[in-house]
Each structure stands twice: as C-alpha cells, then as structure tokens.
Interface confidence: low
C-alpha cells in the first residue's frame, strides 16, 4: 500500500490522543533503555509502512500483536485516514486471525514495540526542509502542510 | 548519558566571523533536532535556528537569516553555528540545545555548557 | 512569529510564599515548556509540555494553561527555587518570553 495519500496531521491525532498511550501501557514495566532501536523511516509515508509492517506482520518470536488495543487503533486511523487502505488488508487479516493462537507478550514482542514507539517519534516530528525554510515541513510531503 | 560539549570562549573583532560547535555523545545524532540559542548579559534567551541532523535541513529565526549558517557533521556526531558580520551586540554566550520529542512536545532537553563570543575591537 | 510576553517580570516573594509566573502568547500554542535559569549556568528544562515535570524537578511545581495563557506555579517556594524563569514554545519557529525572575524578597 502506497501511504503518500494518507492524512497524516489526523493520523499524528490519533497517535497523540490515543495509540501513544496504548503502547506505553503495553511496554509498562519495561525501561526505556532496554532496547535500541534499530529500525528507522525517512518520512510519513515510509514511517507508516514500516509501521503497518511491525503492527500486522507476524515475525519470528511475536506472532500477537495484531490484537493489541494499539493495533486495532492503528488500523482504524489509517482505514479512516488513508484512501483506499481498508481493501487492501482484507486477505492480510484473514490471515492474521488464522496465525493468532493465545495472547503472550514475549520479550521479542516488547522489542518490536519498542521499535514501533520509536517509529510513531519519528512520524510525529517529520524533518526539516534542506531549504532552509522557516516552515517546519516534512521533506517528502508535496500535499500536506502542518506545523508542529 | 546524554552530553553537549560546546567549544572555548571566542574573542573576534567587528565584521569577522566565528563558528561554535557542539559534540553530541549518549544518543543517535541523527534523531534529534538540535537549536542554537544566545543570552546577551544580562538579557532573555534568543532562539537562532535549528537543525535536523538527519538531512541536514535548517530553519532559522529571521533576525539572523543570512548571518547564521547551522551546518553538522554526523561522522563526528557534531553540529555548528557560525555567525558571519559580527557587531558588538553579537557578543553573548552561545548555547546548543537537542530538542526531544517528548509528552506530545518538541522540547530542549539537553544543552551545552555555552561558549561565550566576546565582540570587540 | 509568536510573541510571548511573561509577567510580572520580577517577583519578589519570601521562602515559603506562593509563586505564579504567568506567559501569554499573541496567539494560540499548543503547549508550553518552563525553564529554569540561575546565574552563569545554563538553562534547565523545567516544565515539558505545559504540565509534565521534567526529571527531579519537585512536585511543589505545576503548570497549566491552554491557548494564549500558560501559568507555572511554585505552591511554596524553597531557597533553591529563587532563578529566572522562561517560557518557550515550538510549534511554529521557536520562542522564548522574556523570563521571570523571582527574588527573594
């Protein structure tokens, strides 16, 4: 799925108000030292398709996180907010619901969330125009203008 | 543990130029913007401009534009202030400050030790 | 440009008494940070985002505001908390208001 389309000022809303919260209340208990984050994104759209990938996919050792409470808030913003994203996981949530056994929060599961809190940072403060502009602007974003 | 270690004090004459810089250590370089801000003797803090190490885009406080140049160098984990046509009132103490993004806020969490540029001919 | 104007600009108060600083903005921010100050030292992140104390700072602070009026409050004020204040926002080009200093009466 292609996310340059995205509303990503009402996607960062939804990420302040509500899935923010839901990932620390996941990772409660966890220091924020204890893993380094080794996955990163450039801009929104690439922000977001990482996003996507550590949210729904299952990997090797955290095959649960779809369920999460901050999952399911992730889907539902970027359904709303991006055009064209609902079709585009109906055959991928089949799939999940059929890798989906029991609810273990594994330290490899932390890990890949802890990466995800590192991506949503990143989507939250897009960099600097190479222009020198005064306007805080996301370098890859042609169609969408925000102030932070 | 995160740490801004700024360059020694300047001393420069009207219309010459100086150039401060601000080694970062305890973090990833590329993750955070990083501000310059001055103090005058005695006056308020005044932002310069800001940084992104990470593509190296700038944006500056208008009352500088054209004066200051923010540059880094993400080998060595460092950024730079210079500040060309010194006057008199340029004479300050110079600080960086890395800008987090934290509680929903962009804020200056770290900052420099400051580097005190003295005008004067 | 935002302008932040902070007053009173010096507040002259005794160990134990309540401190209010006030900074308004000339127009809307989403939020506002504090920062503390005291003399040939550099400044401290204070408050983050309107309310959220940063790291060691005591629970005798609060802040709290919205829209154009930010407040920070020392409930009762120690000898360490006497330094100079300032205000700062970030969301469009970044700002400080003049700064508050409290004194010690």
């Known amino acids: 799925y292609d996310f340059t389309n995205c509303d990503f000022e009402k996607i960062k809303a939804a990420y302040l108000s509500t899935i923010s919260k839901d990932l620390i209340t996941y990772m409660s208990g966890t220091k924020s030292t204890e893993f380094n984050n080794t996955v990163s994104c450039s801009n929104r759209p690439h922000c977001l398709t990482e996003i996507q990938s550590l949210t729904f996919n299952p990997t090797a050792g955290c095959a649960s996180l779809a369920k999460e409470m901050f999952a399911m808030k992730t889907k539902a913003a970027l359904a709303i907010w991006c055009p064209g994203y609902s079709e585009t996981q109906i055959n991928a949530t089949q799939a999940m619901k059929k890798a989906r056994k029991s609810k273990v929060t594994t330290n490899k599961c932390l890990e890949q969330v802890s990466q995800l809190q590192g991506l949503w940072r990143r989507f939250n403060r897009p960099l600097l125009k190479q222009q020198g502009s005064s306007d805080y602007k996301d370098d890859d974003d042609k169609h969408h203008h925000h102030h932070h | 543990e995160v740490q801004l270690v700024q360059s020694g004090a300047e001393v420069k004459k009207p219309g010459a130029s100086v150039k401060v810089s601000c080694k970062a250590s305890g973090y990833t370089f590329t993750d955070d913007y990083m501000n310059w801000v001055r103090q005058a003797p005695g006056q308020r803090l005044e932002w310069m401009g800001i940084i992104s190490p990470y593509n190296g885009g700038t944006s500056y406080n208008q009352k500088f534009k054209g004066r200051v140049t923010l540059t880094v160098d993400k080998s060595a984990s460092t950024a730079y202030m210079e500040l060309s046509s010194l006057r008199s009132e340029d004479t300050a103490v110079y600080y960086c400050?890395?800008?987090?993004?934290?509680?929903?806020?962009?804020?200056?969490?770290?900052w420099g030790q400051g580097t005190t540029v003295t005008v004067s001919s | 440009e935002i302008v932040l104007t902070q007053s009173p600009a010096t507040l002259s108060l005794s160990p134990g008494e309540r401190a209010t600083l006030s900074c308004r903005a000339s127009s809307s921010v989403s939020y506002m940070h504090w920062y503390q100050q005291k003399p040939g030292q550099a400044p401290r992140p204070w408050i983050y985002?309107?309310?959220n104390l940063a790291s060691g700072v005591p629970a005798r602070f609060s802040g709290s505001g919205s829209g154009t009026s930010y407040t920070l409050t020392i409930s009762r004020l120690e000898p360490e908390d006497f330094a100079v204040y300032y205000c700062q926002q970030s969301d469009n080009v970044r700002g400080f208001g003049g700064g508050t200093k409290v004194e010690i009466k």
């Open positions: 985002a309107t309310s």
């Open positions: 400050a890395r800008e987090d993004y934290d509680y929903d806020g962009y804020a200056m969490d770290y």
